[in-house]
């Protein structure tokens, strides 16, 4: 006799208004009396519609939450698994049931903002900027909302960057406990003459940090051969172990690059008679503290002019 189990009921993908953080939820299947005491597991698969691969979750819960790109539609499917001790060791699964979440097509794509860029400056404040849609009326203005886990609901930007009295960016500070988790942004717009398409962005703040440049550069030469270059990590909340550095060294007309995770570097002069020796440095958050980052601006250049007399450095 073939054992059968029903799929879950009322599978749906819900948007609680958190800018891309969606709820996938369902109800238990109708289970025949024989299997009432059995443990049910659910195999959930979901993806953005343009994705090649499904994310797969096995759970006993009746809800699963995750972040999605709301610029694209979402599809999911789910089936019931009966635990093997209820089925004499055989694997029993229900058919799949499917659900989808369609994106709003309100407003043409040309009305959506362009070139959204966000930088988390020195791990302290976030600046996002955008350009207006390609074809919008002059009365169009944009509004930015954001959410991350820990906030009760999506918040609107309170400090807009403006150009010609239009919002073209937003500055956010005091983002408590907002790193190492998805940060969701929606920029929507309004015009009396046409609907405006919303734009969604999701990232993690630690991956878009742009530190301040290193400071207090110092160069010393021992035995007229051994060079030691030192610099200080910039001030702010980023600990020294989170930095990686790129150094450009110039000896007379020759220059070369080097890299280190430390805030000093030793090397030998290429030529004893070199007249001047200079270096400058920039930094970025390293692989210990983020998956990615943005290089700081270059520091000021520091030079050692070489020993040419008692008045020299």
């Amino acid at each position: 006799l073939e054992i059968k189990v029903n799929p879950p009921q009322d599978f749906e993908i819900l948007d609680p208004g958190l800018l891309g953080y969606l709820y996938l939820q369902w109800k238990p299947p109708v289970v025949i009396e024989k299997f009432k005491g059995c443990t049910l597991e659910y195999e959930l698969k979901y993806r953005n519609v343009d994705s090649d691969s499904w994310k797969t979750i096995i759970t006993r819960n009746l809800i699963y939450k995750d972040g999605f790109d709301l610029n694209k539609g979402i599809e999911g499917k789910i089936r019931t698994h009966l635990s093997e001790h209820c089925t004499n060791g055989s694997e029993v699964q229900s058919p799949w049931i499917e659900a989808s979440y369609g994106i709003s097509d309100e407003g043409s794509l040309e009305t959506k903002i362009q070139d959204m860029k966000c930088i988390y400056y020195n791990w302290q404040y976030l600046v996002c900027s955008w350009k207006p849609g390609k074809t919008v009326y002059s009365d169009t203005n944009y509004t930015m909302f954001f959410w991350y886990e820990g906030l009760d609901h999506a918040l609107q930007c309170a400090d807009y960057l403006q150009h010609d009295e239009k919002n073209v960016g937003c500055k956010l500070s005091n983002l408590d406990s907002s790193d190492y988790k998805d940060f969701f942004i929606c920029v929507n717009g309004s015009s009396k003459l046409e609907p405006i398409r919303s734009s969604y962005t999701v990232f993690q703040l630690q991956n878009i940090v742009k530190p301040l440049p290193p400071e207090f550069l110092h160069i010393s030469v021992e035995n007229s051969i051994d060079i030691r270059m030192k610099w200080s990590t910039p001030g702010g909340p980023i600990p020294p172990r989170c930095y990686t550095y790129e150094i450009v060294i110039r000896e007379d007309d020759i220059s070369w690059e080097s890299a280190t995770d430390k805030n000093d570097m030793k090397l030998k002069r290429r030529a004893n008679e070199s007249e001047d020796l200079c270096f400058f440095v920039r930094c970025k958050v390293n692989i210990y503290c983020a998956d990615d980052g943005i290089w700081s601006e270059w520091s000021e250049e520091e030079c050692w002019e070489g020993y040419t007399g008692p008045d020299s450095k």
């Epitope: 600990p239 172990r241 989170c242 210990y288 983020a290 998956d291």
Partner: nanobody, 115 residues
Framework: QVQLQESGGGLVQPGGSLRLSCAAS????????MGWYRQAPGKQRERVAG???????VYAASVEGRFTISRDNAKNTGYLQMNNLKPEDTAVYYC?????????WGQGTQVTVSS
């Protein structure tokens, strides 16, 4: 208290392979990067490979193409696959798990490459 334990070191002939493991006693892998360092007698400790929490990797020029770093967050374990080993790879190998809040080092495992 989080502890890191390296294993997999030993004596191997030139051209041989070893796989080092670094097991963490606590759940510190999720948001932290992980690196393998080595220190040969009389030399400074150097990083040979690193991997971010999301899987981005960096390698020292001397091991590029021969060593592969990987991680299994579910097992709180990192790995260093070392192929085509050379005598100059002889050193004590240490693993490090670090992040904005954390910085932990293992006790080290000896790797000796000799015929």
């Amino acid at each position: 208290q989080v502890q890191l334990q390296e294993s997999g070191g030993g004596l191997v002939q030139p051209g041989g392979s070893l796989r080092l493991s670094c097991a963490a006693s606590g759940s510190i892998f999720n948001t932290n990067g992980m690196g393998w360092y080595r220190q040969a007698p009389g030399k400074q400790r150097e990083r040979v490979a690193g991997i971010s929490s999301g899987g981005n990797t960096v390698y020292a020029a001397s091991v590029e193409g021969r060593f592969t770093i990987s991680r299994d967050n579910a097992k709180n374990t990192g790995y260093l696959q070392m192929n085509n080993l050379k005598p100059e790879d002889t050193a004590v190998y240490y693993c490090r798990v670090a992040g904005r809040q954390d910085d932990y080092w293992g006790q080290g495992t000896q790797v000796t490459v000799s015929s």
